[in-house]
Interface confidence: low
């Protein structure tokens, strides 16, 4: 058999792994579609996205509502010709999330 | 130009988007490999993967350590039979990660 | 606050290899985007900017002076080093150290290198 | 290279005046990323120089409002409003948009 104290702890587990904006390592020049010859440093930056489990396998976790945050970056351009720059680059920041229906595709898509 | 302030903060990110043991909800089954008539509720747990950043893109971040933690959850076989039974479960928990060059892949592989 | 100090032998002869160093405080070099550079004056002339290091190990030289200069650091000491090899009485300058940011804002106080036989 | 071309060479000046110094590029010193590093230093005797203007306009933390930067492209100049004693030594322009990053050849202020 099972007791309370266990089902709390099992509870908690899965609110903790329930959608819900995550703080996630987002790589800025993809993020962004620069050119090639662009680099950003840190390439990286931490922002909020929408992550986690839904209850059913035909829900995924999307975003319902997004910010956009500056971060100050070093641009760089190859090759370089003048001291890194810091530029604001500004990324997506999930702030709400929601399970929702995958999109269906349309099967010639 | 830019200050110091401004670097350190810049670099106090970067710290934080490299590559390490993070927090991530992982699927019980599909880590598992269960046949798709076994269900786990809650169906994910958290534990802690590698991820993040690395310097150069032709290197990842890998894990280098693992240990394997005890998860009680729900199994639940369909058509179900009898009361949802706690097991334990053992997911692969990163402990110790590293930036590694990308494993080349062979042409007909 | 960030300081630089520069120090250097003040006199050598012709085609020897002139070595400075930059002690720093204020700032590491290991931080993100950080770089130390070397710029000189002859007396009563202009600046010439000559090399700098980055935080990443990157080195940027002069191509006017590429082939006879060599930088290098010791971050966990908080030192930059610069080389100049073979000499002549054109390299009598003041040499200094600069914080590399864009523009130089924080710049040492100097130190005189003279190169006569 | 970039030829930074300081005029006049010495500027003679009585105090309060207005003092302007030029500074020519031999090229644009517009930046692909759209900005125009060119700068403005003074250097006092036995020091080392100090910034005061960065990026044509931009006046640096406590240089007082009697200096001003103005310009594009390759024509660049330096105003002092009212010229004061300690305003007195050597000033130079620079360019760091392109590599190697380079200096004029100083402009000398003094009272004529």
């Known amino acids: 058999f099972y007791d309370i104290e266990t089902l709390k702890v099992i509870d908690e587990e899965w609110q903790r792994t329930q959608c819900s904006p995550r703080e996630t390592c987002v790589e800025v020049a993809s993020e962004l579609g620069k050119s090639t010859n662009t680099f950003f440093k840190p390439p990286c930056v931490n922002v909020f996205r929408c992550g986690g489990c839904c209850n059913e396998e035909s829900l995924i976790c999307m975003n319902t509502s997004t910010s956009y945050i500056s971060k100050q970056l070093f641009e760089i351009s190859v090759p370089l010709t003048s001291v890194p720059e810091l530029v604001p680059v500004k990324v997506a920041n999930h702030t709400g999330c929601k399970c929702l229906p995958t999109v269906p595709r349309h099967p010639y898509s | 130009f830019y200050d110091i302030e401004t670097l350190k903060v810049i670099d106090e990110e970067w710290q934080r988007t490299q590559c390490s043991p993070r927090e991530t909800c992982v699927e019980v089954a599909s880590e598992l490999g269960k046949s798709t008539n076994t269900f786990f509720k809650p169906p994910c747990v958290n534990v802690f993967r590698c991820g993040g950043c690395c310097n150069e893109e032709s290197l990842i971040c890998m894990n280098t350590s693992t240990s394997y933690i005890s998860k009680q959850l729900f199994e639940i076989s369909v058509p179900l039979t009898s009361v949802p039974e706690l097991v334990p479960v053992k997911v692969a928990n990163h402990t110790g990660c590293k930036c590694l060059p990308t494993v080349p892949r062979h042409p007909y592989s | 606050q960030v300081t630089l100090k520069e120090s250097g032998p003040g006199i050598l002869q012709p085609s020897q290899t002139l070595s400075l160093t930059c002690s720093f405080s204020g700032f590491s070099l290991s931080t993100y985007g950080m770089g130390v550079g070397w710029i000189r004056q002859p007396s009563g002339k202009g600046l010439e900017w000559l090399a700098n290091i980055w935080w990443n190990d990157d080195k940027y030289y002069n191509p006017v002076l590429r082939s006879r200069l060599t930088i290098s650091k010791d971050t966990s000491n908080n030192q930059v080093f610069l080389k100049i090899s073979i000499v002549d009485t054109a390299d009598t300058a003041t040499y200094y150290c600069?914080?590399?940011?864009?523009?130089?804002?924080?710049w040492g106080q100097g130190t005189l290198v003279t190169v006569s036989a | 290279d970039v030829v930074m071309t300081q005029t006049p060479l010495s500027l003679p000046v009585s105090l309060g005046d207005q003092a302007s110094i030029s500074c020519r590029s031999s090229?644009?010193?517009?930046?692909?990323?759209?900005?125009?590093?060119l700068h403005w230093y003074l250097q006092k005797p036995g020091q080392s120089p100090k910034l005061l203007i960065y990026?044509?306009?931009n006046r640096f933390s406590g240089v007082p409002d009697r200096f001003s930067g103005s310009g594009s492209g390759t024509d660049f100049t330096l105003k002092i409003s009212r010229v004061e004693a300690e305003d007195l030594g050597v000033y130079f322009c620079?360019?760091?948009?392109?590599?190697?990053?380079?200096f004029g050849g100083g402009t000398k202020l003094e009272i004529e």
């Open positions: 090229q644009s010193l517009v930046h692909n990323n759209g900005n125009t590093y």
């Open positions: 990026k044509v306009t």
């Open positions: 600069v914080q590399v940011t864009n523009p130089f804002v924080f």
């Open positions: 620079s360019q760091s948009t392109h590599v190697p990053w380079t």
